[in-house]
Amino acid sequence: KFSKQSWGLENEALIVRCPRQGKPSYTVDWYYSQTNKSIPTQERNRVFASGQLLKFLPAAVADSGIYTCIVRSPTFNRTGYANVTIYKKQSDCNVPDYLMYSTVSGSEKNSKIYCPTIDLYNWTAPLEWFKNCQALQGSRYRAHKSFLVIDNVMTEDAGDYTCKFIHNENGANYSVTATRSFTVKDEQGFSLFPVIGAPAQNEIKEVEIGKNANLTCSACFGKGTQFLAAVLWQLNGTKITDFGEPRIQQEEGQNQSFSNGLACLDMVLRIADVKEEDLLLQYDCLALNLHGLRRHTVRLSRKNPIDHHS
């Protein structure tokens, strides 16, 4: 619940907020979970903590990992985890699905596309906007503060929109880009190639040995009733039923949910009494429908209990 996925591109700025909230007066300590090493607060460091924010200026692929934040008050401590993944820049125009922020839908009356995470940064207008890597031109596109407005939305406006802005920190400028898909609402339903919302690709989930753990595979498939959409788990490339470990079971049936008007399915994998050998397995979340199949992988790591108060 108090873990958050964050991602960015190498050589860009990335700012991550602690998933545990507190009053501004509370102190927040940040640690690199794997080593339990404290993150410095001095701004001369490339990676430094600034209250509730963890700043990578700029980010490097080697920064990927789980960061722990502890919000300290006189009466309690609250612990949160930021799972940060920094990716290499793609050589081609395609933005892979693991770099995408949540899909937004628009219609003729409402076609705002907000630039994801921009409120975390110190930026000044105007924003630059691109669709499928092409700079947006023409009077139909209007950049307003932190969002883009498209006039007279048409189905052809659907696609991947990237916002680009500059973060300023103590006089130094850092580039930031963020991409999300925009779909055009239609009264009729439609289906899409599966989009896995959770887990993030190559996610590391922290678990405690001897305790129970749940993994959720969640994917969206389009709008309206979806025909032959499914999500499921595999262990080391094998169906759960064929793997033969009774402690690891897939929930019966798939839960339907809706996210931004899209039809989504969830499948929970329950691991009872987590054992050391479970950390060696690869857990694959598969999403498939009539358009195709996509998979994301999760591995488990042993939780490093820093905070016994929360």
């Epitope: 990716y87 793609q90 395609n94 892979p96 693991y98 690709q201 190559n202 032959l228 499921l232 595999q234 080391n236 490339g237 094998t238 690869q282 694959d284 598969l286 498939l288 009539l290 195709g292 199949l293 996509r294 998979r295 994301h296 992988t297």
Partner: antibody, heavy 119, light 107 residues
Framework: EVQLLESGGGLVKPGGSLRLSCAAS????????MSWVRQAPGKGLEWVSS????????YYADSVKGRFTISRDDSKNTLYLQMNSLKTEDTAVYYC????????????WGQGTLVTVSS | DIQMTQSPSSLSASVGDRVTITCQAS??????LNWYQQKPGKAPKLLIY???TLQSGVPSRFSGSGSGTDFTLTISSLQPEDFATYYC?????????FGPGTKVDIK
């Protein structure tokens, strides 16, 4: 022993049709996804199509979508590829392959059957 | 679609040599990467799946490594029967795609 045996290849004119078959033995055919992969003369491998064990899911490469249809008959342990509106660029050896792990990888392959599209 | 590239496209080596072939995906594919060997006039044969797991019956001189976008197939000591063409293939998402192949021939 797992065996896959393709048949049905031959010479056909552009615009013509052909139906390939793949007879499977040595495993529980209905439990596996099955695929067709082709190889043009002197070229690399190209995935063509796959079908799930339940026949619910059928996927195609863009180059054959709308022209080729994959199907299976579990009672006969046979995989099929119906090829219509054939083009010269469809000339290739067509392999049938068994999938592991929901299109994870191809662990067994047939010996292939040659399809030649020429006028 | 995910594009796969391989290098080199061909190489000449001697029996006993250590041979390394690389495969690169156009986007992140975790470890959903498989390697196949194909000899002239024959069907491909699975060598390695999941980037590094050796298929049953494949000699241990073959090994695979890598994750994300960059992968490697290594033959620690080339044997006469290893002269063939090697293909990588991604299975992260459809359409499934193969690399163009690397031909290993006798020096």
């Amino acid at each position: 022993e797992v065996q896959l045996l393709e048949s049905g290849g031959g010479l056909v004119k552009p615009g013509g049709s052909l139906r390939l078959s793949c007879a499977a033995s040595g495993f529980t055919f209905s439990s596996y996804w099955m695929s067709w992969v082709r190889q043009a003369p002197g070229k690399g491998l190209e995935w063509v199509s796959s079908i799930s064990g339940t026949s619910n899911y059928m996927y195609y490469a863009d180059s054959v979508k709308g022209r080729f249809t994959i199907s299976r008959d579990d009672s006969k342990n046979t995989l099929y590829l119906q090829m219509n509106s054939l083009k010269t660029e469809d000339t290739a050896v067509y392999y049938c392959a068994r999938d592991r792990g929901f299109l994870g990888y191809f662990d067994y392959w047939g010996q292939g059957t040659l399809v030649t599209v020429s006028s | 679609d995910i594009q796969m590239t391989q290098s080199p496209s061909s190489l000449s080596a001697s029996v006993g040599d250590r041979v390394t072939i690389t495969c690169q995906a156009s986007q992140y594919i975790s470890n959903y990467l498989n390697w196949y060997q194909q000899k002239p006039g024959k069907a491909p044969k699975l060598l390695i799946y999941g980037a590094s797991t050796l298929q049953s019956g494949v000699p241990s001189r073959f090994s695979g490594s890598g994750s994300g976008t960059d992968f490697t197939l290594t033959i620690s000591s080339l044997q006469p029967e290893d002269f063939a063409t090697y293909y990588c293939q991604q299975s992260q998402s459809t359409p499934l795609t193969f690399g163009p192949g690397t031909k290993v021939d006798i020096k």
